[in-house]
């Protein structure tokens, strides 16, 4: 027997239902009460999902798991796991048995968007050219860790002076906090990029500091 | 008929070194995962360590990894066990058994057994 | 890991007792859970497997039910050769842990 699976990993979003594909060929004749089919997790070797004896015996993962039944005979012993949740992130190996054997092993990604980043300014009043500024970029619940990038109003990258931190709460999503530190010019708008590199999503936010008006201080 | 027949126990001292060899028939052995199951004087059972069919995954209980290797040949249809450092507590039958299926792990219980070899690590 | 814990630890029962041995788990192991037979001097002898399944050549007074957490090996009518120690084994997970043993012993 030849088990198959998909080459790419399978991305699945947080608290979405995933399918990781698995088909085998049976031969004509060929009956469920042959059929071993188990799915462990790669590296551990625990135990997720299992089909044996002529009979599916359930989940043995968290019992978000589950085969479709109806499909088993045609040669599909692909797993649907539901809710998915960032630790279920990771290899997953399906292995059926019919007279001989073979398994394939299927990566699944996990991915969470990022929110629209809200930005934050320190000093918020009383804004001088030439005064240095904290311009904070916060953006949550999501998952990889993100990506950020700072320019200014030109489009012109801004490198120096970012700090970005990057925290996973209980759910293992990440708030990302990116600080920019800026002397200000006569006006400026500043955009904050946070990129989640798997879903390739992008989100935005800026701030323009437009001065009351800005103007720069009279020479002695 | 399934048979299992470990051989290379005996005694040694600690911090000696051993090789159990379990020879297997009556089954297509490079079809099943194998594994080593002990036990000490009067005690209960304890996985030691499993092996896949094609040796590509190998697992160890806690208390003798890094001092235990388990290979297998299939051309042989023999298992082994390299037992390294051994300690007082390592005294036990040493169980070669048949894993049901190819791989080893979640759902891959063991079917048949061998008769065991006794190890003995004493000074 | 998962610990795996049988009661009682000994009986003592007459042939053609009714006999029950339970074992519990500290999580889940589905249904991948396994009772072995050891007599004095010799190897585990495999009777259940996938919780209910009867192993080829054990007689059918054996059988065993439960889910989860919990499970009972029970041998209907006993025989003057099923006086021996018995385990519980899960395989749901390495590393494979067993029940600490029954010891079913003659009244």
């Known amino acids: 027997v030849e088990v198959q699976v998909s080459e790419d990993p399978v991305v699945a979003l947080v608290d979405t239902d995933a399918t990781l594909r698995c088909s085998f060929s049976p031969e004509p004749g060929f009956s469920l009460a042959q059929l071993n089919l188990i799915w462990q997790l790669t590296d551990t070797k625990q135990l997720v999902h299992s089909f044996t004896e002529g009979r599916d015996q359930g989940s043995a993962y968290s019992n978000r798991t589950a085969l479709f039944p109806d499909l088993l005979v045609q040669g599909n012993a692909s797993l649907r796991l539901q809710r998915v949740r960032v630790t279920d992130e990771g290899s997953y190996t399906c292995f059926v048995s019919i007279q001989d054997f073979d398994s394939a092993a299927v990566s699944l990604q996990v991915a969470a968007p990022y929110s629209k980043p809200s930005m934050t300014l320190e000093p918020n009043k009383d804004l001088r050219p030439g005064n240095m500024v904290t311009i904070t970029c916060s953006s949550y619940q999501g998952y990889p860790e993100a990506e950020v990038f700072w320019k200014d109003g030109q489009g012109v990258p801004l490198t120096g002076n970012v700090t970005t931190s990057q925290m996973a709460n209980e759910r293992g999503l990440f708030d990302v906090h990116s600080v920019l530190r800026v002397v200000l010019g006569a006006n400026g708008t500043y955009s904050c990029l946070v990129r989640n590199p798997v879903l390739q999503q992008d989100a935005h936010g800026s701030v323009t500091i437009t001065g009351q008006p800005l103007t720069f201080p009279p020479e002695a | 008929e399934v048979q299992l027949v470990e051989s290379g126990g005996g005694l040694v001292q600690p911090g000696g070194s051993l090789r159990l060899s379990c020879a297997a028939s009556?089954?297509?052995?490079?079809?099943?995962?194998m594994g080593w199951v002990r036990q000490a004087p009067g005690k209960g059972l304890e996985w030691v360590s499993s092996?896949?069919?094609?040796?590509?995954?190998?697992e160890y209980a806690d208390s003798v990894k890094g001092r235990f290797t388990i290979s297998r040949d299939n051309s042989k249809n023999t298992l082994y066990l390299q037992m390294n450092s051994l300690r007082a507590e390592d005294t036990a039958v040493y169980y070669c058994?048949?894993?049901?299926?190819?791989?080893?792990?979640?759902?891959?219980?063991?079917?048949?057994w061998g008769q065991g070899t006794l190890v003995t690590v004493s000074s | 890991d998962i610990q795996m814990t049988q009661s009682p630890s000994s009986l003592s029962a007459s042939v053609g007792d009714r006999v029950t041995i339970t074992c519990r788990a500290s999580?889940?192991?589905?249904?991948?859970l396994a009772w072995y037979q050891q007599k004095p001097g010799k190897a585990p002898k495999l009777l259940i497997y996938?919780?209910?399944s009867l192993q080829s050549g054990v007689p059918s007074r054996f059988s065993g039910s439960g889910s989860g957490t919990d499970f009972t090996l029970t041998i209907s009518s006993l025989q003057p050769e099923d006086f021996a120690t018995y385990y519980c084994?899960?395989?749901?997970?390495?590393?494979?842990?067993f029940g600490q043993g029954t010891k079913v012993e003659i009244k």
């Open positions: 009556g089954f297509t052995f490079s079809d099943y995962g």
């Open positions: 996938l919780t209910s």
């Open positions: 058994a048949r894993a049901w299926i190819a791989i080893i792990g979640g759902g891959a219980h063991f079917d048949y």
């Open positions: 999580q889940s192991v589905s249904s991948h």
């Open positions: 084994m899960q395989s749901k997970s390495l590393p494979f842990t």
């Open positions: 092996i896949s069919w094609d040796s590509s995954s190998k």
